[in-house]
Every structure is written in structure tokens, then in C-alpha cells.
């Protein structure tokens, strides 16, 4: 899987948008790691 | 209204350093990363690195590792690139950009500084 | 590095014209690609991303398809405003790359 901070920035805007933006506020591409996915 | 302002054009001597701004707005800066991308006259873009504002890690195209240095003033919500022994060749347009989630899902870019360096 | 090849480099078309440019990877990058228009004096301005979705606010006469080494950018009707030059960008290895160009000129 992508891990360059393009792909987790796009992998965590689906998230978002799938979850309704309804996760933690400190969910955001600079504090995920790939880990997250 | 997200914004990433750059600084003014610039005109260096060979083998001198330049420091080029990224003034950002309208977002929270420590939560995306920053990119660098230049462009020749005429020529491709070319990515140079990025940066975590959040912790400060970087990643750079090998082609300008150590000579190209990416920071970040939290505080002013600024990102900076810096390039050392500049020579004929890093005449170019500099641009930097951060892929944005909210408030708006977007791909912003900064409007560019020129770099030109001539003895 | 990974290689773009961007074709053609240039193409003249009119207003209402089907445009195809097409980009191909020297390996697999999945679909991290995205695509920019650029005008001249201007930043590039990001049209799409993940190979096939579109940016909000962008015209849905752009589509971009693939997945792998190959990759599409169609504008399906060339708008006045469209004439420009199209770069594609993997975005899957460090370093990002970018495909050469293409020149999209009036006929």
C-alpha cells in the first residue's frame, strides 16, 4: 500500500467522507500514520 | 478562503543561498503537509520535498538533498525552502502546494517565486 | 525514479472537440496519479487525483481512467478556457514525478 503523505492525505479524506467526519479531531494526514490504514 | 502566499522574486548570485516563503491561511497549518515543486523555463515540474509542519520530517527527491532545506515556522504558519550553491541551472519558478481536506477538499497551490540566478 | 511519459507532447484541436492525453508510468503506481492544467504565468491548477476523481469545481468535461503504468486525461468538449498545457503526476514512490507536458493549442 501507498504510504508517500499524498496517498495517506487522499486515504484519510475517504475515510472522512465515508464516516461522515465523524472521527477524532486529531485524525488529520500529519498525525496518521500508515498504521492507520 | 484557504491561501498559500509566497514571497517576492529573487535574483542570486552563483554559489549563494535562497530562502523562499510559504505564508498559509485559511486552514489549520500543522494538519497537511507541504510540498515543493519548481519549474525551468520551458521545462517539467519537478518535485523537490515535503514537509510535516506537525513534526517537521521531511522527504526530498535525492537530486537536491543537501542542498535543499524544507522548515517550517509554526507559529507564523509559514513553510520555508531553502537552496544552497545555486548555479546557472535552479533559474526557475517555485511553487509551493498542500492538498487540503478541510474546509475544502483541494489541491492549493501558492503563486510562485522566481529564482533566477546569474552571475 | 519512476518515469512519465506524457503523449502526445502537443496537439492542436477546436472548441467542441473529444481531447485524449495519455501518461504512462515505467512501473506500476497503482492509481496515485493526478492530473494539472497549467496556463502560462500561472501555477498549475489540480484537475484530478487518485487517476479518476475530480477536485470540486472542476468541470465534469474532465475525466481522467487507469490504473497500473497507463493513464487518460479526456476533456470531452474543449472549452475556450481549456487551451493550456496538461502535466501528469505520480504521487505513489518518492520522488514524485511528472510527465512532460502536453500543449493543448487552438486549431
Known amino acids: 500500500s501507498c504510504n508517500t503523505a499524498t496517498c495517506v492525505t487522499h486515504r484519510l479524506a475517504g475515510l472522512l467522507s465515508r464516516s461522515g467526519g465523524v472521527v477524532k479531531d486529531n485524525f488529520v494526514p500529519t498525525n496518521v500514520g500508515s498504521e492507520a490504514f | 478562503e484557504v491561501q498559500l502566499v509566497q514571497s517576492g522574486a529573487e535574483v542570486k548570485k552563483p554559489g549563494a543561498s535562497v530562502k523562499v516563503s510559504c505564508k498559509a491561511s485559511g486552514y489549520t497549518f500543522t494538519d497537511y503537509y507541504m510540498n515543493w515543486v519548481r519549474q525551468a523555463p520551458g521545462q517539467r515540474l519537478e518535485w523537490i520535498g515535503d514537509i510535516n509542519p506537525n513534526t517537521g520530517g521531511t522527504n526530498y527527491n535525492q537530486k537536491f538533498k543537501g542542498r535543499a532545506t524544507l522548515t517550517v515556522d509554526k507559529s507564523a504558519s509559514t513553510a520555508y525552502m531553502e537552496l544552497s550553491s545555486l548555479r546557472s541551472e535552479d533559474t526557475a519558478v517555485y511553487y509551493c502546494?498542500?492538498?487540503?481536506?478541510?474546509?475544502?477538499?483541494?489541491?492549493?497551490w501558492g503563486q510562485g517565486t522566481t529564482v533566477t540566478v546569474s552571475s | 525514479d519512476i518515469q512519465m511519459t506524457q503523449s502526445p507532447s502537443s496537439l492542436s484541436a477546436s472548441v467542441g472537440d473529444r481531447v485524449t492525453i495519455t501518461c504512462k508510468a515505467s512501473q506500476n503506481v497503482d492509481t496515485n496519479v493526478a492530473w494539472f492544467q497549467q496556463k502560462p504565468g500561472k501555477a498549475p491548477k489540480s484537475l484530478i487525483y487518485s487517476a479518476s476523481y475530480r477536485y470540486s469545481g472542476v468541470p465534469s468535461r474532465f475525466s481522467g481512467s487507469g490504473s497500473g503504468t497507463d493513464f487518460t486525461l479526456t476533456i470531452s468538449s474543449l472549452q475556450p478556457e481549456d487551451f493550456a498545457t496538461y502535466y501528469c503526476q505520480q504521487y505513489n514512490n518518492y520522488p514524485y514525478t511528472f510527465g512532460g507536458g502536453t500543449k493543448v493549442e487552438i486549431k
Open positions: 502546494a498542500s492538498i487540503i481536506i478541510v474546509p475544502n477538499y483541494f489541491d492549493y
